[in-house]
Amino acid sequence: APISSHCRLDKSNFQQPYITNRTFMLAKEASLADNNTDVRLIGEKLFHGVSMSERCYLMKQVLNFTLEEVLFPQSDRFQPYMQEVVPFLARLSNRLSTCHIEGDDLHIQRNVQKLKDTVKKLGESGEIKAIGELDLLFMSLRNACI
């Protein structure tokens, strides 16, 4: 299996009551605007065929996509939460900038691409869904990277 390096986040990143609460509030606010409840972006399908040791690297890819393709374009929405949560997630992304896996990551890229394709196919409602799943993104980063 590919070896992952520098794919770690300190537990303290997920134990800050204020920003954690704001992240979950943002997710809730967006999920209220999400009518497509049958589709889930972060779940079993995303992790299918990905070993536990590779999951942080996978979540780094999902985090970067979410920031660049969803949160930045939607940054004027869901205030005041968005203006606080985006810098927090950007810091996590920066801390994972040296997270790589040695060897073939095609299976990971394939799973991430499916998530990206789903978001793109749904258009703006896909972006809203991704914001509504920030609580799942938070939990998945926490479980995969600490």
Epitope: E44, H48, D135
Partner: antibody, heavy 119, light 107 residues
Framework: QVQLVESGAEVKKPGASVKVSCKAS????????ISWVRQAPGQGLEWMGW????????NYAQKFQGRVTMTTDTSTSTAYMELRGLRSDDTAVYYC????????????WGQGTLVTVSS | DIQMTQSPSTLSASIGDRVTITCRAS???YHWLAWYQQKPGKAPKL??????SLASGAPSRFSGSGFGTDFTLTISSLQPDDFATYYC?????????IGGGTKLEIK
């Protein structure tokens, strides 16, 4: 409509095994997981475990590790829960419930299957 | 495993009352908490998910709140149909656990 239909009541001897089925309809079976919860007579609810209908991955409560097996058959949209080495305190109603996945609640429940363990 | 402690275990109330049931987790579970209602001989029914989101089909008199370790289920004005047993369930870790239940009785 969306529903889960469980198999009928069972009476088993101590030491035997039981296999309860849960047939799903009205939704895409592989988009959800199935969790199993049991309830002994006059008691509260007890979580037993979960199976992914997409990957077949399972997660069992520690209490049931080694004694329970949860599976799915996507061709028939059916989930199964097998409990081995039955004891009298396994007498309970066994419920299956639809689980949207990580960290989510159970929005649809089966009607329950009463399993009685008696010599 | 995370332990869920519900209180009270039994609650007597009258029609029209405002009722609150509490649930405490032994460690932080963010908002991964659900509330279910169960009537004798029936399967549980989802009322609240993610601590405060009202489930489809659940009456609006039910509401949930809390984050972290302390959660509440509130019924704003008790109706005859509400006398039942209520359970909280945490999904903050892969092993879900369920509270001991609160039986709501007619005073």
């Amino acid at each position: 409509q969306v529903q889960l239909v469980e198999s009928g009541a069972e009476v088993k001897k101590p030491g035997a095994s039981v296999k309860v089925s849960c047939k799903a309809s009205g939704y895409t079976f592989t988009s959800y997981g199935i969790s199993w919860v049991r309830q002994a007579p006059g008691q509260g609810l007890e979580w037993m475990g979960w199976v992914s209908a997409y990957t077949g991955n399972t997660n069992y409560a520690q209490k049931f590790q080694g004694r329970v097996t949860m599976t799915t058959d996507t061709s028939t949209s059916t989930a199964y829960m097998e409990l081995r080495g039955l004891r009298s305190d396994d007498t309970a109603v066994y419920y299956c419930a639809r689980d949207r996945g990580y960290y989510d609640a159970y929005d649809i429940w089966g009607q329950g299957t009463l399993v009685t363990v008696s010599s | 495993d995370i332990q869920m402690t519900q209180s009270p275990s039994t609650l007597s109330a009258s029609i029209g009352d405002r009722v609150t049931i509490t649930c405490r987790a032994s460690e932080g579970i963010y908002h991964w908490l659900a509330w279910y209602q169960q009537k004798p001989g029936k399967a549980p029914k989802l009322l609240i998910y993610k601590a405060s989101s009202l489930a489809s089909g659940a009456p609006s008199r039910f509401s949930g709140s809390g984050f972290g370790t302390d959660f509440t289920l509130t019924i704003s004005s008790l109706q005859p149909d509400d006398f039942a047993t209520y359970y909280c369930q945490q999904m903050g870790e892969y092993n879900a656990t369920i509270g001991g239940g609160t039986k709501l009785e007619i005073k």
